[in-house]
């Protein structure tokens, strides 16, 4: 015959543990039910009554099966340099990540404690290492035969066009200018971008018309949507 299924609360067999989604209550010395995510233990179990669970209040949560007396408080509202990527619900904490053009300079267990604006590379310099969610942009000087004419956190150095006859030679911050109407070989028009990480934005496209107010997720300084060291003395 199959073993009889015990209903909580029940005394466990010596040496055995409580089942999944149950916990051992030291006071009652019984296996008792845990509360589901989004709930907490309002009344702990006794030898004759199981745990009484209640829903988490607003702005509090429990993410796991638990027997905590109070739900955890959700984190504070996301700061102006961040975007709320996960809302506070009864079952999950709020998660804030850096908005486009920023990276996480100081992480916390989930999300980001402090964002900083991505540096940009000035003309004559291209992106050697793009910004990521947790690291700043690294720039490098454009090598001979390449150029960048933008101030950008995404553009790399790209080759000068090759002319039949050069009118103006290219340099690190300017493409070559050809005398003939068409060069023998040229790059496709437009800036070359590195793959754009979640935390960067294009520095070139101008919306038309320009909006006069920022969306609620946008910041400054840097103040931002933009923002947050330097060659030899960088941070």
């Amino acid at each position: 015959l199959p073993a009889q299924v015990a209903f909580t609360p029940y005394a466990p067999e010596p040496g055995s543990t409580c089942r999944l989604r149950e916990y051992y209550d030291q006071t009652a010395q019984m296996c008792c039910s845990k509360c589901s995510p989004g709930q907490h233990a309002k009344v702990f179990c006794t030898k004759t009554s199981d745990t009484v669970c209640d829903s988490c209040e607003d702005s509090t949560y429990t993410q796991l099966w638990n027997w905590v007396p109070e739900c955890l408080s959700c984190g504070s509202r996301c700061s102006s340099d961040q975007v709320e990527t996960q809302a506070c619900t009864r079952e999950q904490n709020r998660i804030c990540t850096c908005r486009p053009g920023w990276y996480c300079a100081l992480s916390k267990q989930e999300g980001c404690r402090l964002c900083a604006p991505l540096r940009k590379c000035r003309p004559g310099f291209g992106v050697a290492r793009p910004g990521t969610e947790t690291s700043d942009v690294v720039c490098k000087p454009c090598a001979p035969g390449t150029f960048s004419n933008t101030t950008s956190s995404t553009d790399i150095c790209r080759p000068h066009q090759i002319c039949n006859v050069v009118a103006i030679p290219g340099n690190a911050s300017m493409d070559a200018v050809c005398t003939s109407t068409s060069p023998t070989r040229s790059m496709a028009p437009g800036a070359v971008h590195l793959p754009q990480p979640v935390s960067t934005r294009s520095q070139h496209t101008q919306p038309t018309p320009e909006p006069s107010t920022a969306p609620s997720t946008s910041f400054l300084l840097p103040m931002g949507p933009s923002p947050p060291a330097e060659g030899s003395t960088g941070d």
Epitope: S80, T151, Q203, L221, P222, G231, D235
Partner: antibody, heavy 124, light 110 residues
Framework: EVQLVESGGGLVQPGGSLRLSCAAS????????INWVRQAPGKGLEWVGI???????NFANWAKGRFTISRDNSKNTLYLQMNSLRAEDTAVYYC??????????????????WGQGTLVTVSS | DIQMTQSPSSLSASVGDRVTITCQAS??????LAWYQQKPGKAPKLLIY???ILTSGVPSRFSGSGSGTDFTLTISSLQPEDFATYYC????????????FGGGTKVEIK
């Protein structure tokens, strides 16, 4: 030489409007975040607002709804439109580039250069 | 909204003195802090960015330190041309900003 020059200041009556200009030379306005900062006579610096490279704008809480920032890329000029002016808006208004250049990097969180400023007086 | 509290609001010092100005942020701003010098009738001039990096052309007697919420501007040996007002500025110009500047510190001749 990288330079910003403000213009358009003057005397205006309370409730009136004024549009300030900030002309850039030596760099393209559209590739930098540009800020407006003001300074009332004998007082400290007060941030007014910013226009980011993408054209989005942000303002100090006290300036929202009354001030707007726009940009004319063809003229390489920035504008600050101020409406419903009050006596407490009397100040020198500066434009400042968000982006200090160093070692190939641009730091958008530092303001450099600044214009020379233009005085706005709101009085009846 | 990050608030910057600068102290002292004014100080008197003599040429050659070591001068220290502090700036406290109401919440952590990492190293996103700049210092400016302003002389009467002139626009502010950037001295230090990212808390401790000196801008080109600024004398080495100026130095910046700090991270998080507490920052310091130090002038190791005050010179006659250093008498001015100094401002700190945090690097966040977001959606809930009242001001990004501290209240200023006026350095006067004793």
């Amino acid at each position: 030489e990288v330079q910003l020059v403000e213009s358009g200041g003057g005397l205006v009556q309370p409730g009136g409007s004024l549009r300030l200009s900030c002309a850039a030379s030596g760099f393209s306005l559209s590739t930098y975040d540009i800020n407006w900062v003001r300074q009332a006579p004998g007082k400290g610096l007060e941030w007014v607002g910013i226009i980011y490279t993408g054209g989005i704008t942000n303002f100090a809480n006290w300036a929202k709804g009354r001030f707007t920032i726009s940009r004319d890329n063809s003229k390489n000029t920035l504008y600050l439109q101020m409406n419903s002016l009050r006596a407490e808006d009397t100040a020198v208004y500066y434009c400042a580039r968000g982006g200090y250049d160093s070692e190939g990097y641009v730091y958008p969180d530092a303001f450099d250069p600044w214009g020379q400023g233009t005085l706005v007086t709101v009085s009846s | 909204d990050i608030q910057m509290t600068q102290s002292p609001s004014s100080l008197s010092a003599s040429v050659g003195d070591r001068v220290t100005i502090t700036c406290q942020a109401s919440e952590s701003i990492s190293n996103l802090l700049a210092w400016y010098q302003q002389k009467p009738g002139k626009a502010p001039k950037l001295l230090i960015y990212r808390a401790s990096i000196l801008t080109s052309g600024v004398p080495s007697r100026f130095s910046g330190s700090g991270s998080g919420t507490d920052f310091t501007l130090t002038i190791s040996s005050l010179q006659p041309e250093d008498f001015a007002t100094y401002y700190c500025q945090h690097g966040y110009t977001g959606t809930n900003v009242q001001n990004v500047f501290g209240g200023g510190t006026k350095v006067e001749i004793k």
